[in-house]
Structures are given as structure tokens and as C-alpha cells.
Interface confidence: low
């Protein structure tokens, strides 16, 4: 039959070449002469000439050694043709299988493998996997089957068998307990790969196992006890830096310290933070310390790590004895703001109050006093006793210095410390009213018509407080009651001024005496401008003479100018009056006076 079974040819054959492998034979060769040929890669296409065939005998020839790792199988076609070149058989498949020889050593994929494992892990924990390859066949032979082993371990601490490697997978794992980064941070393993499943050629590589840090070391205080001195009253004062050592990896969460005050700070006076660079605990005051209350604090500070402990570890505690340094503290007035009631107008030298300060220091320091701010200069203070006395007249009604009956004074206390310190206090004198002001009418100038005059209502004010105010009483003095009346209203807080007799146009002084509920009398002169008009008036209509009739004051130089105008008007007035043939009593007086003034002017 025109069929060939697959041909197995070992690689690396020694020849001699050409080497006969198999004979192609067509049973058509009985009828005619047959010529044989082969085609395909390895024959007439690359790699050309590896195989050939004897044209007439059909022997398949191998011309050179084969390399399985290059080509493991050749697929050729055999051809049979007659002398005339006609094909006598269909092309035949020829399979040439190159069989393996153990001609390659294993090769590790890396010269150095790197892996890591946490310190303190249990045996059986996987670390890393290494890989070696072998180009030889591992399917039909053991030539390419690699077996892994550990040749050596450095260092050999705590002993020389800390790791194992899986024979076939190359997985390295921990075989013994006792990995301690702080003692051995890194192991170097020399690993082997051997083909023939461990019986063949060997190659080596290095596996470096880094031991990763676990928080298996507690931070420890060095020293464990501290003494510090802190001035009293200072907030944010750095008291002490506490130093710890930790064998874990610097700047890792297993190394970074966390501090807590676990005792001795009942008053919550302190706080502790971690310095980001030095890892020290920085103890500072959160509140001011008070030497007089407690001159020493013994604090207990505990330190842990940012990361939780990987194993059960004792927590370190330090003792910090904080000694409070005495500082000269300012005297404090008691109370800081003192309210004292005092009658206004008390005599000079009269005591007002005693206002003293206490010194927080317990050294019986001498305190001296003085007034710091006394706007009106009404007070003095005894430097030794703190006795405040009046040196001026306290006036409740003095609006410049007194607000809402209160006169505010600032006083100062100074101790004799070194250096001296001062404290201030506020003295609020509530001035008790005395009936030292009589009632005063407002306004004090009025304008009123001399015909059907409107009653003038004047408000009465009294700077004093009740009961030294209304109801008020009014009385006209100095003959003002001849022409005027003054009556206080029912409420007793206004006075009504009325013109009861005719007065010619002029300015008059009305002498009004008002007295309050406490009979404090005040005389006020009301300036009344009487106008020639009827009913209500704001200002006198037309030109008017500002003479001194009826007790009015002279208009001075202005009168001279006004008289010129009056003289001109006088003629007109005479004509009007003579025509009307009517002359009232007040008109006669007025014209008579005008005539006199005209003569004076001409003179």
C-alpha cells in the first residue's frame, strides 16, 4: 500500500549521513518504472534538504542531525510518478517525529527572585514562587521535568531550615517558626532546579526573602521618669518631651508612637501629642497651672503605636513629675466690679467705700492702691487701705461724667512682688439724688399778642429725680403779676403764662419763681416779646420798636436805625388816625412816644 507509518527519529543523531529512515514503495512499480520524490518543509522548502529520497529506490534519507527543540515534527509529502512523469499515486503524508534527548539544562526565569513574608508567621505560610524552564520534553520523557530544592540558606538563624520549596511547583513557604525581622530582616536562599525530575542536570538561582515588619515590639520609654518645671498660669507651655524607642520599622505605623495621659491629670490641665519627626511625646499645658492650689502634679503617660500590636505586648508607662513654679500673680479686686450707692454732694473728705484686692500669691505681699481713671476728679484712694473718699463734689446731674446715675471709676492694685504686678477694678458709684436743682421752665423766651393773647404753655424740667420734682408750684415776682398770670396745670409739670393786661409792643422780663415737691425754688426770667396783634403769633408782624418800656431792655444802636424808619411811618399813622377819628389809650401812648423819639433824633 502507498502508506507510511509515522517515523520516529532521535534528535542529535550521530549519522553517518545521509541516514536511511524508511523506504517509499508504490505497488504500481510492477507495471512501470517509478520515480519517487518528497516535498514540504524540510525537503524542498525551508529548512530545505534536511530530508531527501532516493529517486529510484524510494529510500527516505536524513541528511543532518535533528534538533527537537527547533522542530519537533516534520510533515512531508511523498510522490510517485511514472517514467513519463505521470502521477501514479496520490501524494502521501509522511510524519517524522523527532524524539527528545536530554540536551538542555533547566533555566530559572530570573537570576534573583524576590519575595516577602511577615515576621512571626506560622509554618506553612507561602512566601513566593520561583520558576525554572527546561526546553526538553516533559510530556513523553522526564528530560524536561524540573524538580526544585533549596540548596542553602543565609543566615542560618534561628536555624538553617526556615523555608521549604515545593518540589514541582517551586512555591517557597515557611517551614519553621521564629522569623523575627528585628533579628534577621532578610534571608538569601540558593535554590536549585534539576531536570529528569531531580536526577538530571542542575541549575541554581537566588531567592531573597524580605521579612516584613509586624508590630511585635512595644515602644519603650527612655527614660521612664521625668521631672519638669512649669511657671504657673501659662497655657500651651511645653512641659516635657518624652522619648521612646521602638525596634519596629522607623516611620511606620508600628513605630509611630501614640501617647495618653492615664493618670494624675484629674483637672485636665495637660495634653500630650506626638512630634511628627522625633516621635517624642510633647507634653504641654492645656490650662494654666496654679502654684497656690497645687504645686506639683505627678502624671502617668502610656505609649502605644498607631498600629495595633500584632502580639500581646506590655504597654510602657512613664512618670512625669511636674513642679509648678510660683509666679508673682496680679492682685484681683473682689469683686472685679463693685457697685456702691453714695449720695451726691457729700462733703469733701467723706468716705465713699473701701475697695480692696486679694493677691493669689500666698506670701502676704503688700498691696497698694491708686485711682487709675476718675474722669471728674471727684475721688481719692488710700494707698494702704483701699479707702475711697470724696475730694470733689459728686454731682449726679453732671451729664458729662454721669450716665444713668452711675459714675464709673477705675482703680488699680499693685503688689510688691519682683517684678510688681497690677490688677484693676471698676468702681460703679450709684449717685443717690439730692434735691439740689430747682425747676426750670422751657422755653424761656415767648412771643405773645397784646390783643386776645394765646396762653403760653411752658414745660417745667427739674434735673433731680422724684420725689424732688413734680408737682411744681409757680409764683410771679418783682411785680410781674401786674400784667401776667402763671398757673401750674393739674399734672403739675407745665406752667401756663397769660397776659392779663394790655402791654404795648415791646420786650418784657417776666420774673417766674418755680418750686418743686421738695420746695426747692428756682427764679427764672422769661423773655416775653409782646406784639401788636390778635390771637396767636410766632414773630411780631411788621417793624416794631425794641425800646425799654415796661421794664423792657433797650435795643441799643439798632434802635437808632429803626427810629428813622418809624419817623417816616409816623406821618402816615397820624394821617390814618386823624381820618378815622379813633384813638385808643395804648395808641396815644405809642404815638406820644414816637413823637418824642422823633424829636430826639432831630436833636
Amino acid at each position: 500500500d502507498w502508506v507510511v507509518a509515522p517515523i520516529s527519529v532521535p534528535e542529535n543523531g550521530k549519522g553517518p549521513f545521509p541516514q536511511r529512515l524508511n523506504q517509499l514503495k508504490s505497488n504500481k512499480d510492477r507495471d512501470t518504472k517509478i520515480f519517487y520524490s518528497i516535498t514540504g518543509p524540510g525537503a524542498d522548502s525551508p529548512p530545505e534538504g534536511v530530508f531527501a529520497v532516493e529517486k529510484e529506490t524510494g529510500w527516505l534519507l536524513l541528511n543532518k542531525p535533528l534538533d527537537r527543540e527547533e522542530i519537533a515534527k516534520y510533515e512531508l509529502f511523498g510522490h510517485a510518478v511514472s517514467e513519463n512523469g505521470a502521477s501514479v499515486e496520490d501524494p502521501m503524508n509522511i510524519s517524522i517525529i523527532v524524539t527528545d534527548q536530554n540536551d538542555h539544562k533547566p533555566k530559572f526565569t530570573q537570576d534573583t527572585f524576590r519575595g516577602s513574608v511577615l515576621e512571626g508567621v506560622l509554618p506553612g505560610t507561602s512566601v513566593m514562587q520561583v520558576t525554572a524552564t527546561d526546553e526538553d520534553d516533559a510530556i513523553y520523557t522526564y528530560n524536561g521535568v524540573v524538580a526544585y530544592s533549596i540548596h542553602s540558606q543565609e543566615p542560618k538563624d534561628p536555624h538553617d531550615l526556615m523555608f521549604t520549596i515545593h518540589r514541582s511547583t517551586g512555591t517557597i513557604s515557611v517551614i519553621s517558626s521564629g522569623l523575627d525581622r528585628e533579628k534577621v530582616p532578610e534571608y538569601t536562599l540558593t535554590i536549585q532546579a534539576t531536570d529528569m525530575d531531580g536526577d538530571g542536570s542542575t541549575t541554581t538561582a537566588v531567592a531573597v526573602v524580605e521579612i516584613l515588619d509586624a508590630n511585635d515590639n512595644a515602644p519603650m520609654f527612655e527614660p521612664q521618669k521625668y521631672e519638669a518645671w512649669v511657671p504657673e498660669n501659662e497655657v500651651g507651655h511645653e512641659v516635657q518631651r518624652l522619648t521612646v524607642t521602638d525596634l519596629d520599622v522607623p516611620n511606620s505605623p508600628a513605630w509611630r508612637a501614640t501617647y495618653h495621659i492615664v493618670g494624675g491629670d484629674d483637672g485636665d490641665h495637660f495634653t500630650i501629642t506626638t512630634h511628627p519627626e522625633t516621635n517624642q511625646g510633647v507634653l504641654t499645658t492645656k490650662k494654666g497651672l496654679d502654684f497656690e492650689a497645687q504645686d506639683q502634679h505627678t502624671l502617668y503617660v502610656e505609649v502605644t503605636n498607631e498600629a495595633p500590636f500584632a502580639v500581646k505586648l506590655p504597654t510602657a508607662t512613664a512618670t512625669v513629675v511636674v513642679h509648678v513654679k510660683d509666679v508673682n500673680e496680679a492682685p484681683v479686686f473682689v469683686p472685679p466690679s463693685k457697685v456702691v450707692e453714695v449720695q451726691e454732694g457729700i462733703p469733701t473728705g467723706e468716705p465713699v467705700c473701701v475697695y480692696t484686692a486679694e493677691d493669689p500669691d500666698k506670701e502676704n505681699q503688700k498691696i497698694s492702691y491708686r485711682i487709675l481713671r476718675d474722669p471728674a476728679g471727684w475721688l481719692a484712694m488710700d494707698p494702704d487701705s483701699g479707702q475711697v473718699t470724696a475730694v470733689g463734689t459728686l454731682d449726679r446731674e453732671d451729664e458729662q461724667f454721669v450716665r444713668n446715675n452711675i459714675y464709673e471709676v477705675m482703680v488699680l492694685a499693685m503688689d510688691n512682688g519682683s517684678p510688681p504686678t497690677t490688677g484693676t477694678g471698676t468702681l460703679l458709684l450709684t449717685l443717690i439724688d439730692v434735691n439740689d436743682h430747682g425747676p426750670v421752665p422751657e422755653p424761656r423766651q415767648i412771643t405773645i399778642c397784646n390783643q386776645s393773647p394765646v396762653r403760653q404753655v411752658l414745660n417745667i424740667t427739674d434735673k433731680d429725680l422724684s420725689p424732688h420734682t413734680s408737682p411744681f408750684q409757680a409764683q410771679l415776682t418783682d411785680d410781674s403779676d401786674i400784667y401776667w398770670t402763671a398757673e401750674v396745670n393739674e399734672e403739675g409739670d407745665t406752667v401756663v403764662l397769660s397776659l392779663k393786661k394790655f402791654l404795648k409792643q415791646d420786650t418784657y422780663d417776666v420774673h417766674l419763681s418755680l418750686s418743686d415737691h421738695g420746695n426747692k425754688e428756682q427764679l427764672t426770667v422769661i423773655r416775653a416779646t409782646v406784639c401788636d396783634c390778635h390771637g396767636h403769633v410766632e414773630t411780631c408782624p411788621g417793624p416794631w420798636k425794641g425800646g425799654s418800656g415796661g421794664g423792657g431792655s433797650g435795643a441799643g444802636v439798632i434802635a437808632v436805625i429803626v427810629v428813622v424808619v418809624i419817623a417816616i411811618v409816623a406821618g402816615i399813622v397820624v394821617l390814618v388816625i386823624s381820618r378815622k377819628k379813633r384813638m385808643a389809650k395804648y395808641e396815644k401812648a405809642e404815638i406820644k412816644e414816637m413823637g418824642e423819639m422823633h424829636r430826639e433824633l432831630n436833636a
Epitope: K225, E227, W229, F291, D295, Q296, T298, V321, H323, V324, K325, D326, S418
Partner: antibody
Framework: VQLVEQSGAEVVKPGASVKITCKAS????????MNWVRQRPGKGLEWIGH????????NYNGKFKGKVTLTADKSSNTAYMQLSDLTPEDSAVYFC?????????????WGQGTTVTVSS | ELVMTQTPSSLSASLGDRVTISCRAS??????LNWYQQKPDGTVKLLIY???RLHSGVPSRFSGSGSGTDYSLTISNLEQEDIATYFC?????????FGGGTKLEIK
């Protein structure tokens, strides 16, 4: 009145030990460090160490470690200083002195001193 | 340890004189400088603490000043009872240390 009174003079042989007492009165003995100071003949003052009677806590000047042991008895308001393995070099006046509430800061109240003479 | 250097080691003055004793620290002691008086009978008393603060019962003729490393004790009006040896002492660093002393005599 705050008082610190010391025991009387001691004459001891080389190699022996001596225990000096210091009795306090007029203040809260437990709350203040009690210091010990040495003055050799014709010399200055040297701080030996101190004890906090409240908890028995002690601190020593390095040069006196091993030579001196400080103790205190709160119940009797008494502080003690034991000097051991005495040599003539240890002959001195030893003072106890009460801190003013701040360790090492200043010594406010002093005992009258105890003279120790080491002589064979 | 911190060294305290006191000058002069001895001094002679007349009654009524103003006397000054100096003390220098080998490093900054932040005003924690105290002065003691040791009488001829051996008794020791605190005069001044924290550079300038007079201890209770000490006459006002004693005063102290200074800062950093340099400090002084002044007796403004020397009296017979002031005849003594004076020591400075720093309380800023452990261990506390004393100056060598200044022996004050009357001329």
C-alpha cells in the same frame, strides 16, 4: 513654723555605715521633696539627692550613687540618709533641706547639719 | 553637670557699704538662680530665689538680679550680722549645683 531638725554628730570607723536622721515639722512632710547636701571641710555645697516621702521616690546625684541610700517614714515625718562603706573622704557636714515645692529649684528650709567624721 | 562660677571667693567691706557678689552659669538657667547665706556657725538660710525674689523674713537690703547665665546678689547697706559665706545655686538642670561660695568679712 516650718522646722527641719537633724541628728547629732557621728564619729565612725572606715568601712562602717552611718544613718543620719532629719525630722520635719510644721508642713505636709509627704508633699515636698527632702534634699540632702554635703559640705566637706572648707569646701562648697554639693547636692546628694532627694526623696519624695509621699511615695518614696528618689533621685541621686550620679557621684553619690552606691554610697548613699535615702529613705523616709511618713508616719514619723522623718527622712533618713544612710552612708555606707565610709572612707575619710566622706567626712563632712551633711544637711537636709526642704524644697519649696519644686524639685531642685530652691531649698527653703535647712536643717542645722550633721557632722560625720570617719576616723580609725 | 552645670557649673556655677562665683566671684569673688572672698571680699572685705566696711559696715554700710554696698556689696555685690557675682555668679555665672555654664549655660542659660532661665532665672532659676538662688542665693543662700551660711553663717559662721554653719546654719544655712535661703535669701533669694528665682533670681530676685526675697524669701520670707529676709531684710530688704538684700536684692538679686540677672538673666541667662549672669546673676548677682547685692547687699545695699552692709550690717554686722551679714558676715557670712554666700552661695549661689541653680535649679534649672538636674543635678542642682552650687557656686564655690563668697566669704564676706568686715574691714
Amino acid at each position: 513654723v516650718q522646722l527641719v531638725e537633724q541628728s547629732g554628730a557621728e564619729v565612725v570607723k572606715p568601712g562602717a555605715s552611718v544613718k543620719i536622721t532629719c525630722k520635719a515639722s510644721g508642713y505636709a512632710f509627704s508633699s515636698y521633696w527632702m534634699n540632702w547636701v554635703r559640705q566637706r571641710p572648707g569646701k562648697g555645697l554639693e547636692w546628694i539627692g532627694h526623696i519624695y516621702p509621699g511615695d518614696g521616690d528618689t533621685n541621686y546625684n550620679g557621684k553619690f550613687k552606691g554610697k548613699v541610700t535615702l529613705t523616709a517614714d511618713k508616719s514619723s515625718n522623718t527622712a533618713y540618709m544612710q552612708l555606707s562603706d565610709l572612707t575619710p573622704e566622706d567626712s563632712a557636714v551633711y544637711f537636709c533641706a526642704r524644697d519649696r515645692g519644686s524639685f531642685g529649684a530652691w531649698f527653703a528650709y535647712w536643717g542645722q547639719g550633721t557632722t560625720v567624721t570617719v576616723s580609725s | 553637670e552645670l557649673v556655677m562660677t562665683q566671684t569673688p571667693s572672698s571680699l572685705s567691706a566696711s559696715l554700710g557699704d554696698r556689696v555685690t557678689i557675682s555668679c555665672r552659669a555654664s549655660q542659660d538657667i532661665s532665672n532659676y538662680l538662688n542665693w543662700y547665706q551660711q553663717k559662721p556657725d554653719g546654719t544655712v538660710k535661703l535669701l533669694i530665689y528665682y533670681t530676685s525674689r526675697l524669701h520670707s523674713g529676709v531684710p530688704s537690703r538684700f536684692s538679686g538680679s540677672g538673666s541667662g547665665t549672669d546673676y548677682s546678689l547685692t547687699i545695699s547697706n552692709l550690717e554686722q550680722e551679714d558676715i557670712a559665706t554666700y552661695f549661689c545655686q541653680q535649679g534649672n538642670r538636674n543635678p542642682p549645683t552650687f557656686g564655690g561660695g563668697t566669704k564676706l568679712e568686715i574691714k
